[in-house]
Structures are given as structure tokens and as C-alpha cells.
């Protein structure tokens, strides 16, 4: 590959690539060094090459770009800005590239970007404006339809003194740019809670994956606005029970399939409504696999086989009768 590159956008919001301008006219559809390109498939793969920056000389035809398994560390503003822009780029996979910092406007000037995968990067510093590109209260709509953010939680010693959940949600909600998002995957992020406003502001969601987190309760989460939701993955969390409000909301979603396997269900008197609902509903996939984890006497009992007599709560003793 010769040292020419596609000239960059000169937008002030993309200063990084404003210097990636070729010294002579760019070869129109050259393949960057260390990458594999297929013009027929409109695909460029720069995979497991220890790249520390996004290649500057990406071919204009690229529709699918794989930059996985690299050492990018940081995505600055306008990391993919080019002149002419990468107008066809629709799917961008950056998984496993040691990114820990994604700045505001990192994905600007990608007018066709529909799928973005940032999974398996320890994102200690995800800008609130990473996806919206601006700090306006209402941004231009993002073209993103699918956002994959599985296992982006950094190691505990690298997390900042702020809520990781809050940082991610701020990026999802900024400028209401992701109103068109249909698939959101947030699996394996140690989420303890889901901020109550996040789902209400993503009304187009069809698929939501929250599996393998540490969610204890959905009490303050509302699914009511997600009228298009088709799949909700809640497997491998720390859910103890689903309460009436949540059950009713889920039942009211016309296309929903819910996945609840491998949660530590507490089969006491608070579980009665959920058991009744499970016996009647068709929305829970594999509901016959759901089993109790607590109390000890109920461990491994199948929820669908329980009746109200099984679901009791120990009476609360008055303080004078409690023993230590």
C-alpha cells in the first residue's frame, strides 16, 4: 500500500482526521496494508493486526468494516471521517480492540452506519456524545439500528468514580439520537440496575439483551413504551421475583418473547403472582426450566409445578422474640 489516503472531512468536530490527507491523489479503492478487502462483498477486514489507529486509506466502497482484535485504545472525534465520506459504511465491528476511550463524535460522518459492535472493550471512558456526536439537547438522528455493547465493563480497578450503568445510559440517551435503535445488546456488563428512563427513550427497540448482568429487580423499569419489543433477554441475572406491574407490562407487549433462565428465584409468598402468571402466559420462553434457588427447602423446584401452599413466608417475629 502506498502512503496515500482518502482525504478526511474538514469538519471542526473531526479534527483528528483533518490531517489524514494524501500527498497525491488517492488511489480510489486501494486496500490498506494489513487488511483484506473484497470489493465484491464491499468488505474490509483488518483483524488481529495490532493496529493502534483506524486505517486512513479505507476504500470508499466499504460497507462492512471489521477492525476486531486490535489495540486501538482510543477513538477520537471523527475517527472514521473521510473526504469523500465513507458513505456506504453500514456495519462496523470494533470488538476486542482494547478500546478504553470513545470520544464525542467518534462515529460522525458515517451517514449509513446501521450496525456498530463495541463488545469486549473495557470502556472506562465512553463519552455521553459518542453516538450522538454533539452536546445539543436534541441531536440529528443517528442511523444506528443495531448497537452491540456486550462485555464493555472495564476491570474494577479501571472504573472511574461514577456509575458504569449511568455512563452507558448517558451515551444511549444523549440528544435522543438513538430513537431508531432496534437492537441493543448490553450483556455481561455487571449491571446492578437499569436506570428507569432508558427504555422509555428507545421506543423502536425490537431486541434487548441484558443477559449475564447482576440485575436484582425490575421494579422501577417500565417496558410499557416498548410496543415493538420482540425479545427480552434477562437470563443469568440476579432476579428474585417479578412483581405484578412488570408482569402486566410484559403481558401487554404484543410480540414479546422473554428469556428468564438461570436467575436465583426466591420461592416464597412474594412469588405467588409470578407463578400464576407463568402458568398462563405464552411470552416466557423455556418457562418449564425456571427453578427456585431460595429458600433452601425449595431449591431446584420447578416454578410451574408450585402451588400457593408451597409459597409461604416465615412470619416476622416481634423484636422481643427475635434471637440473634
Amino acid at each position: 500500500s502506498s502512503p496515500t489516503s482518502s482525504a478526511s472531512s474538514f469538519s471542526s468536530s473531526a479534527p483528528f482526521l483533518a490531517s489524514a490527507v494524501s500527498a497525491q491523489p488517492p488511489l480510489p479503492d486501494q486496500c490498506p496494508a494489513l487488511c483484506e478487502c473484497s470489493e465484491a462483498a464491499r468488505t474490509v477486514k483488518c483483524v488481529n493486526r495490532n493496529l493502534t489507529e483506524v486505517p486512513t486509506d479505507l476504500p470508499a466502497y466499504v460497507r462492512n468494516l471489521f477492525l476486531t482484535g486490535n489495540q486501538l485504545a482510543v477513538l477520537p472525534a471523527g475517527a472514521f471521517a473521510r473526504r469523500p465520506p465513507l458513505a456506504e459504511l453500514a456495519a462496523l465491528n470494533l470488538s476486542g480492540s482494547r478500546l478504553d476511550e470513545v470520544r464525542a463524535g467518534a462515529f460522525e460522518h458515517l451517514p449509513s452506519l446501521r450496525q456498530l459492535d463495541l463488545s469486549h472493550n473495557p470502556l472506562a471512558d465512553l463519552s455521553p456524545f459518542a453516538f450522538s456526536g454533539s452536546n445539543a439537547s436534541v441531536s440529528a438522528p443517528s442511523p444506528l439500528v443495531e448497537l452491540i455493547l456486550n462485555h464493555i465493563v472495564p476491570p474494577e480497578d479501571e472504573r472511574q468514580n461514577r456509575s458504569f450503568e449511568g455512563m452507558v445510559v448517558a451515551a444511549l440517551l444523549a440528544g435522543r439520537a438513538l430513537q431508531g435503535l432496534r437492537r441493543l445488546e448490553l450483556a455481561s456488563n455487571h449491571f446492578l440496575y437499569l436506570p428507569r428512563d432508558v427504555l422509555a427513550q428507545l421506543p423502536s427497540l425490537r431486541h434487548l439483551d441484558l443477559s449475564n448482568n447482576s440485575l436484582v429487580s425490575l421494579t422501577y423499569v417500565s417496558f410499557r413504551n416498548l410496543t415493538h419489543l420482540e425479545s427480552l433477554h434477562l437470563e443469568d441475572n440476579a432476579l428474585k421475583v417479578l412483581h405484578n406491574g412488570t408482569l402486566a407490562e410484559l403481558q401487554g407487549l404484543p410480540h414479546i418473547r422473554v428469556f428468564l433462565d438461570n436467575n436465583p428465584w426466591v420461592c416464597d409468598c412474594h412469588m405467588a403472582d409470578m407463578v400464576t402468571w407463568l402458568k398462563e402466559t405464552e411470552v416466557v420462553q423455556g418457562k418449564d426450566r425456571l427453578t427456585c434457588a431460595y429458600p433452601e427447602k425449595m431449591r431446584n423446584r420447578v416454578l410451574l409445578e408450585l402451588n400457593s401452599a408451597d409459597l409461604d413466608c416465615d412470619p416476622i417475629l416481634p423484636p422481643s422474640l427475635q434471637t440473634s
Epitope: S1, P3, T4, S5, P15, F16, L17, A18, S19, A20, S22, P32, A33, L34, C35, C46, R49, N50, L51, T52, E53, V54, P55, T56, D57, Q71, A73, V74, P76, A77, D100, E101, R103, A124, D125, E158, Q160
Partner: antibody, heavy 120, light 111 residues
Framework: EVQLVESGGGLVQPGGSLRLSCAAS????????MHWVRQAPGKGLEWVSY????????YYADTVKGRFTISRDNAKNSLYLQMNSLRDEDTAVYYC?????????????WGQGTTVTVSS | DIVMTQSPDSLAVSLGERATINCRAS??????????LHWYQQKPGQPPKLLIY???NLESGVPDRFSGSGSGTDFTLTISSLQAEDVAVYYC?????????FGQGTKLEIK
Amino acid sequence: EVQLVESGGGLVQPGGSLRLSCAASGFTFSNFGMHWVRQAPGKGLEWVSYISSGSTSFYYADTVKGRFTISRDNAKNSLYLQMNSLRDEDTAVYYCSRTNSLLRGFFDAWGQGTTVTVSS
Amino acid sequence: DIVMTQSPDSLAVSLGERATINCRASQSVSSSSYTYLHWYQQKPGQPPKLLIYSASNLESGVPDRFSGSGSGTDFTLTISSLQAEDVAVYYCQHSWEIPLTFGQGTKLEIK
């Protein structure tokens, strides 16, 4: 020991061309990004250009954009700077420098420099 | 472009005394993950030499009388006890974005 040795400098007329070279030794050249940095007589340091380890990324200062081309040959452990349409203000000592990455990196090894004089 | 401004332009300090050089960036060059600010020493007739990277990390082989601090826009290079061999010009440099830019330099002399 890390060594960077620049060559190719000299006296050239405005509008002329020069090609600078930097020979690297003492480290795995293909693992490092490389920069050119220059210093006009009696002045401070000015970043000129960068090339990534595998020649996938190239960046230039606005002052040289469209006139200078950075390249490298990892098989020869060599870095190059092709300088065309030279101007008086390009007169400087040109240093090549090593880095582990562009933004997260820094200039951790420098050559002794080669002098470029543009004058009629 | 980010402008790096050093102060003072020149500084005279007695041997064994503390020397402090400041560097200010025209915008923040820190994130919560990394600080994109580095310090170099250039002695007469020699190329620059890396002293401090990422604001406060001492480069291997650099005497520990050199230290760096700061974040955001304001940074400091400190020489705790000036030695004769520290006479040089000192530069700060950011790597936040392209173009990379240096401060104008601070000339350190012995009083």
C-alpha cells in the same frame, strides 16, 4: 541500544525536492509508529508527519500537507520523507522519532537530525 | 489546533534549588483514561529527550529529581534539586489529537 540515523538533508532551491531517510536499529522497527519532527533554526519543535507501524495510517501537519509524503520499508528498517515543492520555511533540522501509538504514544527515541536548507 | 503555552520563557535557578516550569493547553488534554501530555529536554546541539510521559510518568533512565503533575489544561514539570547537567530547553507536548503540538519551550539556566 535504540538508534535512529537520519540522512538526505542538504541545500535545495525553493520548489525543489529532497528525500530524507531514517535508518533504525536496536529495536523491532515493524512494531512502532514513526514520526518526523522538525526544528527551524533557533526555534521550537514542530510535528510534521506520522506513519503507523504497518503503514495503515498516515498523518500530516497542515503546513506540509500535499507536499510531503511519509513512507516506510519495514524489511529495510527504514523510514522516509519525500519533500516536494520545498519552501524557505521548510528550512530546519528534521528528526525521526519512534512511538508506540499516535495518540497514546510519545516520542521516546530520537535521531540526531539531518539539516535541510531551502534557499536560492 | 490545540495551543500549548509554557511559562516562563526562560528561568534561572541556583544549583540545588527547585525549578518549576508550567504548561497550559488551550483545551483539556486529559480523559478519565489517560493524560495526553508529555515533557522533553533538549540540550544544545542535541535532539530532544523524553523525560515524562502522560503528565506524571518518569521515563526509564531519567533521574527522579524530575517529576510531572497536572491534568486537564494545566501541567507542571518540577526539578527538585537543579544540577548543572539540567541546563537545557524544556518542551511540553500534547497527543490529544492531530496535529500534535509542542509548547514554545522554556530555557533553564543556572543562576
